[in-house]
Interface confidence: low
């Protein structure tokens, strides 16, 4: 279930599966929310640790019970992963924070007469992740009303300093607020060029597209289907970047599909998550249980409610069947996209929902004269 | 909304218009929305108006203006009033509205969370208020949301500033001493939230108030919290399961 | 004391023109629905217009509509009736009424004017 | 449009007398129904409003009772007061009237 408490004073000990640095336990927690494997995640506030190297620190963790044991730590804040969350899922994060400078690759520098000027152009900017405004009192004149256009390797921080006079935030991409607008065509037999930031294998070109979406540094994507003459590149996502934010060149190629990240579309963004069932399709992974169930659609269900679960494979094989039962592997990996992808089955595949924001799975920890 | 600011696209998703289609079309309140098929309101929004067709329900807009004939809106389904409440009164001032289609939920249309049943024990300090209603007392309806941070009052205080009116356990009030801002006509039955532990959570329906935004006048609100017994119950007893965000 | 005087009646020949008012006192007047209802002599009673508080919001009975407009100046605590195309079949005794509950809606009315007579005659 | 219709139109009754009047709608309209009294020249006045409930000032002898489409205005016992004419009025949807009941001396 949904889990949304937080825990003052207290810190998750062991688990940890990534770490980072943010500006709060809220952008911590969004953080663990949308990483495959992360259930629980503590934050470190700069008031609750001297060591320089870990203030702000944001530990990501998993645990194959779902808990961990929680140690005292003055000022920490631990607390649960959303998946499961429905409506409460979201990368959006629009809190500005002041009295700190969020640092990354600064890429591009302006006059801006706010803080929320510096916000909207790192939302209409397509590389922009994050950006450190210097108010109009910072102690250097020359830098005042500076805006710092960031990003970074993993689309948050590589360090965090409290600094007077400097406020700091995140795009607002995410909350389908960017002007930049997007590209919704997938391109057939087209193959993008430039940097690939990551690697996935995908049913689909559209789960690659979501996949690319969310991730932090992609902007566009090609995926290699099933029939792709080289057999260990099929079914592989390539997610990709570029300095321009533009592939700088494509090459006609039969089966292939490329196509964009959603992230800079204007009032609408996909859900973090792929409700499709791709029969006759068997997701590779590491095993995480086996239950009887009928048919598919439980199947799916049993792996949404299990929090760990990110993909499923439900076998309609004679020995796998028990009267109208029939077994359902439920599976995960490290990056939450299946480790192998294999066609001509019998059977069926798909991903857990836990991510999608529609659910009602959703719960909240939320005069005389009439108006 | 008194003294407040404008708002922007995503920032409160959960706001919803409340429109009425006679000869013209007409914002009369605001609302909550709290599930894919529910709003929360104030009751006396349908005040001699109960019936569903005139009604049309906006959500994920900001700016009035931007509505044409186009713009998609839901239809009700029910009105679900609260059983005790009274025309000639403000008490129970809480109504449920069922739409007829469910809605998908998107950064710009998805649910308030509500509080736990009872919730006294919380002290919240980052509370707004939204809608489009007046920016002055002989005001007009505003075209884009406007937002307001407004601090919650105890009951006491409140009670004091209105000795004609009984102000009970399940309103809730919000002001500023001096005054300055507040609710206003229009507003009524759009949310009162507040953050907590990062997450905002429906704590009063804007209700009524002495004038708007007058010194020692604050609004009255609602207490959303008194009332998630009735919101549960109804929304459950519909359909047989719970369509709205509840309590942990 | 909360009173409300209606003003304007008179005799006007058929398809002419005639504006009806209702001067409020005694109340916040900008916080009410007002509303206009008729009666010929006679006869019973008749809804004829309804405004909201703000004023945004008007309605009419089908009989008047297109015909007749209401509309506030709440800074004089005023209501207006403006009748256009008058026909024999307005003639009755125009009343201004309101709810005086201490919060606005569409209701009963427990607050009346005394009434102005508009006869429509050649 | 919802209808009003009141019946009966006339009634005699002495002083004293249990008197009731019924309203019926064409269409269900809750308990958003009012009555009124209304004397020669004189503007009406409210008795009863949403149905059942008394407006302020009126006497216990008047009570109203129905919801949906049947309603009812009882006066439990006739005063000289009393002799009027005798309106329902839905406020559901817009506003309409029944065409009156007019209560005489028998």
């Known amino acids: 279930g949904c889990l949304t408490q937080l825990y003052e004073n207290a810190f998750f000990r062991g688990g940890d599966v990534a770490s980072m640095y943010t500006p709060n336990a809220q952008y911590c927690q969004m953080r663990c929310t949308f990483h495959p494997r992360c259930l629980l995640f503590s934050f470190l506030p700069a008031s609750s640790i001297n060591d320089m190297e870990k203030r702000f620190g944001c530990f990501l963790k998993d645990s194959v019970t779902g808990t961990l044991p929680k140690v005292h730590r003055t000022g920490a804040v631990s607390g649960h992963s959303l998946k499961q969350c429905g409506h409460q899922i979201s990368a959006c994060h629009r809190d500005i924070y002041k009295g700190v400078d969020m640092r990354g690759v600064n890429f591009n520098v302006s006059k801006v007469s706010s803080v929320e000027e510096c916000q909207k152009r790192c939302t209409s900017n397509i590389r922009c992740q994050f950006f450190s405004y210097a108010t109009q009192t910072f102690h250097k004149a020359e830098y005042r009303n500076n805006c710092l256009l960031k990003y970074s390797p993993g689309g948050t921080p590589t360090a965090i300093k409290v600094l007077s006079n400097v406020e700091s935030g995140f795009s607002l991409k995410p909350c389908a607020l960017s002007e930049i607008g997007c590209h919704m065509n997938i391109f057939q037999h087209l193959a993008f060029s430039d940097v690939d930031v990551a690697r996935v294998l995908t049913p689909d070109a559209f789960v690659c597209r979501t996949i690319c979406t969310y991730h932090p540094n992609c902007l566009f994507f090609t995926f290699y289907t099933n029939v792709w003459k080289i057999e260990s590149q099929r079914n592989v996502c390539l997610l990709k970047t570029s300095e321009s934010g533009t592939p700088s060149s494509s090459t006609p190629q039969e089966n292939t599909i490329s196509g964009y990240s959603l992230l800079t579309c204007k009032r609408t963004l996909p859900e973090p998550c792929h409700s499709k069932i791709y029969p006759g399709v068997d997701f590779g992974g590491e095993e995480l249980n086996v239950t009887f169930v009928k048919g598919v659609n439980v199947c799916q269900e049993t792996c949404t409610k299990m929090i760990r679960c990110q993909f499923f494979t439900y076998s309609l094989l004679p020995e796998d069947c028990k009267e109208e039962k029939c077994k359902c592997f439920l599976r995960l990996s490290m990056d939450g996209s299946p480790t192998r992808i294999a066609y001509g089955t019998q059977g069926s595949s798909g991903y857990s929902l836990r991510l999608c924001n529609t659910g009602d799975n959703s719960v909240c920890t939320t005069k005389t004269s009439t108006r | 909304i008194v003294g407040g600011t404008n708002s922007s696209w995503g920032e409160w998703p959960w706001q919803v218009s409340l429109q009425v289609k006679l000869t013209a079309q007409r914002h009369l309140c605001g609302g909550s929305l709290i599930g894919h098929q529910w709003v929360l309101t104030a009751a006396h929004c349908f005040d001699g108006l109960p019936l569903q067709d005139v009604w049309r329900i906006y959500s994920g807009i900001l700016n009035l203006s931007d509505i044409t004939k186009d713009t998609p809106f839901s239809q009700i389904k029910e009105i679900i009033i609260h059983q005790n409440y009274k025309v000639s009164e403000g008490n129970h001032d809480i109504a449920l509205i069922k739409l007829q289609a469910p809605l998908n939920y998107t950064e710009f249309q998805k649910p308030i969370c509500l509080p736990s049943k009872g919730d006294t024990s919380t002290i919240y300090t980052n509370c707004w208020v939204t809608g489009w209603g007046f920016s002055k007392e002989k005001g007009e309806i505003q075209n884009i949301l406007q937002k307001v941070n407004i601090p919650l009052v105890t009951n006491e205080e409140c009670q004091k500033r209105y000795q004609d009116y009984k102000i009970t356990q399940r309103m809730v009030c919000a002001g500023y001493k001096e005054g300055g801002k507040d609710a206003c006509k229009g507003d009524s039955g759009g949310p009162l939230v507040c953050k907590h532990n990062g997450m905002w959570r429906l704590v009063g329906i804007t209700s009524w108030g002495e004038g708007c935004a007058r010194r020692e006048q604050p609004g009255v609100y609602t207490k959303v919290a008194e009332y998630m017994d009735w919101i549960l119950e109804k929304t459950q007893s519909s359909d047989g399961k719970a369509q709205m965000q509840s309590p942990a | 004391e909360v009173q409300l005087l209606e003003s304007g009646g008179g005799l006007v020949q058929p398809g002419g023109s005639l504006r009806l008012s209702c001067a409020a006192s005694?109340?916040?007047?900008?916080?009410?629905?007002m509303m206009w209802v008729r009666q010929a002599p006679g006869k019973g009673l008749e809804w004829v217009s309804g405004i909201y508080s703000s004023g945004g919001i008007t309605v009419y009975a089908d009989s008047v509509k297109g015909r007749f407009t209401i509309s506030r100046d709440n800074s004089k605590n005023t209501l207006y009736l403006q009748m256009n195309s008058l026909r024999a079949e307005d003639t009755a005794v125009y009343y201004c009424?309101?709810?005086?509950?201490?919060?606005?809606?569409?209701?009963?009315?427990?607050?009346w004017g005394q009434g102005t007579m508009v006869t429509v005659s050649s | 449009d919802i209808q009003m219709t009141q019946s009966p139109s006339t009634l005699s009754a002495s002083v004293g007398d249990r008197v009731t009047i019924t309203c019926r709608a064409s269409q269900s309209i809750s308990s958003w129904l009012a009555w009124y009294q209304q004397k020669p020249g004189k503007a009406p006045n409210l008795l009863i409003y949403k149905a059942s409930t008394l407006e302020s000032g009126v006497p216990s002898r008047f009570s109203g009772s129905g919801s949906g489409t049947e309603f009812t205005l009882t006066i439990s016992s006739l005063q000289p007061d009393d002799f009027a004419t005798y309106y329902c009025q839905q406020y559901n949807t817009y506003w309409t009237f029944g065409q009156g009941t007019k209560v005489e001396i028998k």
């Open positions: 005694g109340f916040t007047f900008s916080h009410y629905i």
């Open positions: 009424a309101y709810r005086r509950t201490g919060i606005p809606r569409w209701d009963a009315f427990d607050i």
